[in-house]
Every structure is written in structure tokens, then in C-alpha cells.
Amino acid sequence: LTCLGGFASPGPVPPSTALRELIEELVNITQNQKAPLCNGSMVWSINLTAGMYCAALESLINVSGCSAIEKTQRMLSGFCPHKVSAGQFSSLHVRDTKIEVAQFVKDLLLHLKKLFREGQFN
């Protein structure tokens, strides 16, 4: 799943079912957002690079009591090879930048969409 190198191939490769479900969940969150997501909770911004799934989980796991992102948290844990607990941080975090959960989710979704369009849209 961390190998996304195949996108330079002649045709696009659709994501695995698990990744497809993660994208769909992020879409649901961004489209169905009525009130401020997670009461406007702030999380550390991350570098959207190779280890982004773990980094995203490390950031989001610090948000508790927010049912809207619980499914996303569970899904991300399936993409991260190691156990992640609250307060844990990797070098992928931009430690001086905090953003709202809603923006974090939107950024993650945009990045995933960009990954799957690479190699097919010129």
C-alpha cells in the first residue's frame, strides 16, 4: 500500500478496496459536514509523503470523543504497520503548524486524489 510507484505506467491503477473505502469516508466527512468538525479541534499538520498514513493517524488519534472521524482513525490504523497511540509524533509532523480537523481531512483527501490522478492526467 505504501508503494505508489506504479502510477507512471501507461494506464492508471485503481486503488485497493481498503484505500477506496478510506477515500469514500473522507469524501463523506467533507461533504456531510454541518457543524464544525470535532468542535473545531486542532491537530498537527503533516507532510503528505511516503509515511503519511501513520503520520495522519498520529495526528488524528489525539482527537477524542469525535464520532465523525472514528471510522477514519480505524481505517488509517489498517494502513500503518506499527501501533500508534496518543501523544506519539513522527518526523513527518509539521510541529509548528496546527490546523482544524476539517482542513486536515480535506488536505488528506486532496492528496490521495492527486496520487491516483498521477500518470493519467497530463
Epitope: V13, P14, P15, V27, L110
Partner: antibody, heavy 119, light 107 residues
């Protein structure tokens, strides 16, 4: 509600160009790709290509490469499809449709634009 | 290019009967297969996505199944408004392709 409204019917001469517009409303335009599909009279559906409004990136069916150009104007949430060097077999209804990502289905379609190529 | 072959080309049935439409892909496309209904003078309408996922607002009599190369759209009991042309679509890889269509007509 989501709507894709296309420009009106066109009659063109062989060798000419046509530019069909598709105005989107009811959703965030840059969140979805716009795909173009055509249907010749009494025939099936044929995918022409797609554009990502966020980046302007395009993907064209090899069959139309060099003759088709897809563009968007994000300020008006409008997508355009221009087909050049028209031939009589380009006579068809041209549809725009939106897709979240290419592997998703085309969940909303425009009403179609009939382009007739005749001398 | 992934070629989708739909069969039969025409299906003649009566209201109340069960319709079974087939779509075969030239290579494995997992469940990246979508079904559309088209009536004369109208744009196609999405019925089923990812081979078997239903769409809200689409009657429950429409169902899809299959994975890999063989897919089926089933209409459990035909209503008068179901007589139309049905297309399958490859969502797996570019170029996106459609089957030739199956026309469901009144017997």
C-alpha cells in the same frame, strides 16, 4: 441539487470545429473530474476524455488525440470540449458527466448536445 | 484497452418477468464495473456502481453481481418504465470503455 447544463445544438460543416460547454452547479466544481462521452445516432456510448478542473490536467482517448481539447473555467464552473476537423461521423450527442475520481461512476450527466456535421 | 461485451443485444420480455443482462470484460477489472440505464432522448442514468453497490433512489428490483471478468445486472420484476437500453462501463483503467448495450424491449 447537482446539475450539469450543456450548450445548445450545433450544425457544422466538415472540417470545422465545435466547442460544447457544460456548466456545473450544486457542488464544488474542482472536487470532481469532468468526463466527455459521445453517442452517434442509434449507437452506443464512447468515452472521449476527461479533465481535472483543479489542475487543468487532461486525459484523452487516443482515438481523439490531436483533435480534441478539454478546458475548464473555474470562475464560472464551466467545462468545455472542443473538437476540430469535424467529419460526418462526428455527428453525435455529446454528454458531459462528473466523476469524483476516474474509477468512480459517472453519477450526474448533462442533458446532451447534438452536434450535426453536414455539408 | 478493456473491451466489454454485453449479451444479449436485445432481450424481449413481458412486464413482471425477470431480466438478466450480462457484461463480460476482456481482462480482470475486479469490481470496477458500473451499470447505466438509458431511455430514448435522455442521458444515461447510473443504476449500480462497483458491480453490486446500489444507488439511493434506484428501485431495489435492480441488482448487480460479479467480479473479475463476468458481471450481471438483474431486474427482478420488470416494470413498464424499465424497458430501455442498459450499458456497463469499465472504471478500472483508461480509456474508460462501455459495453455495446442491451436493449430490453416489451415482448
Amino acid at each position: 441539487q447537482v446539475q450539469l447544463v450543456q450548450s445548445g445544438a450545433e450544425v457544422k460543416k466538415p472540417g470545422a470545429s465545435v466547442k460544447v460547454s457544460c456548466k456545473a452547479s450544486g457542488y464544488t466544481f474542482i472536487d470532481y473530474e469532468i468526463h466527455w462521452v459521445r453517442q452517434a445516432p442509434g449507437q452506443g456510448l464512447e468515452w472521449m476524455g476527461a479533465i481535472d478542473p483543479e489542475t487543468g490536467g487532461t486525459a484523452y482517448n487516443q482515438k481523439f488525440k490531436g483533435r480534441v481539447t478539454m478546458t475548464t473555467d473555474t470562475s464560472t464552473s464551466t467545462a468545455y470540449m472542443e473538437l476540430r476537423s469535424l467529419r460526418s461521423d462526428d455527428t453525435a450527442v455529446y454528454y458531459c458527466a462528473r466523476i469524483l475520481l476516474y474509477y468512480y461512476p459517472m453519477d450526474y450527466w448533462g442533458q446532451g448536445t447534438l452536434v450535426t456535421v453536414s455539408s | 484497452e478493456i473491451v466489454l461485451t454485453q449479451s444479449p443485444a436485445t432481450l424481449s420480455l413481458s412486464p413482471g418477468e425477470r431480466a438478466t443482462l450480462s457484461c463480460r470484460a476482456s481482462q480482470n477489472i475486479s469490481d470496477y464495473l458500473h451499470w447505466y440505464q438509458q431511455k430514448p432522448g435522455q442521458a444515461p442514468r447510473l443504476l449500480i456502481y462497483y458491480a453490486s453497490q446500489s444507488i439511493s433512489g434506484i428501485p431495489a428490483r435492480f441488482s448487480g453481481s460479479g467480479s473479475g471478468t463476468d458481471f450481471t445486472l438483474t431486474i427482478s420484476s420488470l416494470e413498464p418504465e424499465d424497458f430501455a437500453v442498459y450499458y456497463c462501463q469499465n472504471g478500472h483503467s483508461f480509456p474508460l470503455t462501455f459495453g455495446g448495450g442491451t436493449k430490453v424491449e416489451i415482448k
